[in-house]
């Protein structure tokens, strides 16, 4: 369960891959597409509003919380649209939705080496947002082996003067 309904904090950031490709969002035919691309020098990076929530570890939902909390995040590149996991299609999509957000919009945040982060599906533990063929996809990761896999590592470049209503 998500602890409370409001985020503990929010920040505005641009998102890039471990290899410094930018994650960009484009409105095409009334729906948003997500791209992973090398940005031209002067092109501005797309911003994403990250909202951080606390959640109990699944194992302690009925207990006293000693297993601690997980930090969960939702990612919104434009007003009323959120990144969501489509576990059936192994895809990452942008959907318009109202609060309360569906579980598919929540990702467990993992801090990694080199100040990178990974995003694990709340709805499908062991499945992470990753890069596949210049697109974002859902990638199954063996916990004990490949948590450092470069294709699930992302860099957040925070824009410090953030506003809650963006775009």
């Amino acid at each position: 369960s998500i602890t409370g309904i409001s985020p503990i904090t929010e920040s505005l950031a641009s998102l890039s891959t471990y290899n410094d490709q930018s994650i960009t969002f484009a409105l095409e035919d009334e729906s948003y597409e997500i791209y992973v691309e090398d940005l031209k020098k002067d092109k501005k990076k797309d911003k994403v509003l990250l909202s951080y929530y606390e959640s109990q570890h699944p194992s302690s939902e009925s207990g006293d919380g000693v297993d601690g909390k997980m930090l969960m995040v939702t990612l919104s590149p434009t007003k009323d649209f959120w990144l969501q996991a489509n576990n059936k299609e192994h895809s990452v999509e942008l959907h318009k939705c109202e609060k309360p957000l569906p579980d598919q919009a929540f990702f467990v945040l993992h801090n990694r080496s080199f100040n990178c982060v990974s995003f694990e599906c709340k709805t499908d533990p062991g499945v992470f947002i990753g890069v596949k063929d210049n697109h974002l996809a859902l990638i199954k990761v063996d916990y004990s082996e490949n948590l450092g896999s470069e294709n699930i590592l992302f860099k957040l470049s925070e824009i410090l003067e953030h506003h809650h209503h963006h775009h």
Partner: antibody, heavy 122, light 107 residues
């Protein structure tokens, strides 16, 4: 309840190594990164690195990179921090700590061991 | 590395006083700042996380605020057990770094 119990005080000669243990109980050991800090007498706190008990992956502060090794034994829920080539300025209390969040350091350190005093003296 | 500058390094106050400790980061850390209290011979104790969230079990006289580079810890009404040392810590990027500490002493 969550407990981190560290090994006892050590006195070492310069050039020697020390290995401090941190036994975790009251939670799923593999579900939380373990961090190590130290505090020299009368000084502030210094972060040394972390280990992911699940994978064994580590990340060390550059200052300690060539002298520190963090390991774990999941069968006994214990993390270890070994510091080699000890110098007199390594004299400090060494702490293990568990973060508020399982795999993120953003929330700070919620649970701490009681500390292990390591004295380096000839 | 992100440097954390805490001020003042010490402050003298009386029971019931309001005390404010500030912490400045050398670069922006959004809201990922923690505050700790440390009593002599003991491990630090987490008071505040995410700049303004009160850790469970910590008295409500402790509060935190700020974002970006400037943060404050406020003790609204000092109690006898509050006379000790406080540290801030940036929890944003590696290497994780602490402020130099603020000792709250009895006037």
């Amino acid at each position: 309840q969550v407990q981190l119990v560290q090994s006892g005080a050590e006195v070492k000669k310069p050039g020697a190594s020390v290995k401090v243990s941190c036994k975790a109980s009251g939670y799923t050991f593999t579900g939380h990164y373990m961090y190590w800090m130290r505090q020299a007498p009368g000084q502030g706190l210094e972060w040394m690195g972390w280990i992911n008990p699940n994978s064994g992956g580590t990340n060390y502060a550059q200052k300690f990179q060539d002298r520190v090794t963090m390991t774990r034994d999941t069968s006994i829920s214990t993390a270890y921090m070994e510091l080699s080539r000890l110098r007199s300025d390594d004299t400090a209390v060494y702490y293990c700590a568990r973060g508020r969040y399982g795999s993120s350091w953003y929330g700070g350190f919620e649970y701490w061991g009681q500390g292990t005093l390591v004295t380096v003296s000839s | 590395d992100i440097q954390m500058t805490q001020s003042p390094s010490s402050v003298s106050a009386s029971v019931g006083d309001r005390v404010t400790i500030t912490c400045r980061a050398s670069q922006g850390i959004t809201s990922w700042l923690a505050w700790y209290q440390q009593k002599p011979g003991k491990a630090p104790n987490l008071l505040i996380y995410a700049a303004a969230s009160l850790q469970s079990g910590v008295p409500s006289r402790f509060s935190g605020s700020g974002s970006g580079t400037d943060f404050t810890l406020t003790i609204s009404s000092l109690q006898p057990e509050d006379f000790t040392t406080y540290y801030c810590q940036q929890a944003y990027s590696l290497p994780l770094t602490f402020g130099g500490g603020t000792k709250v002493e009895i006037k």
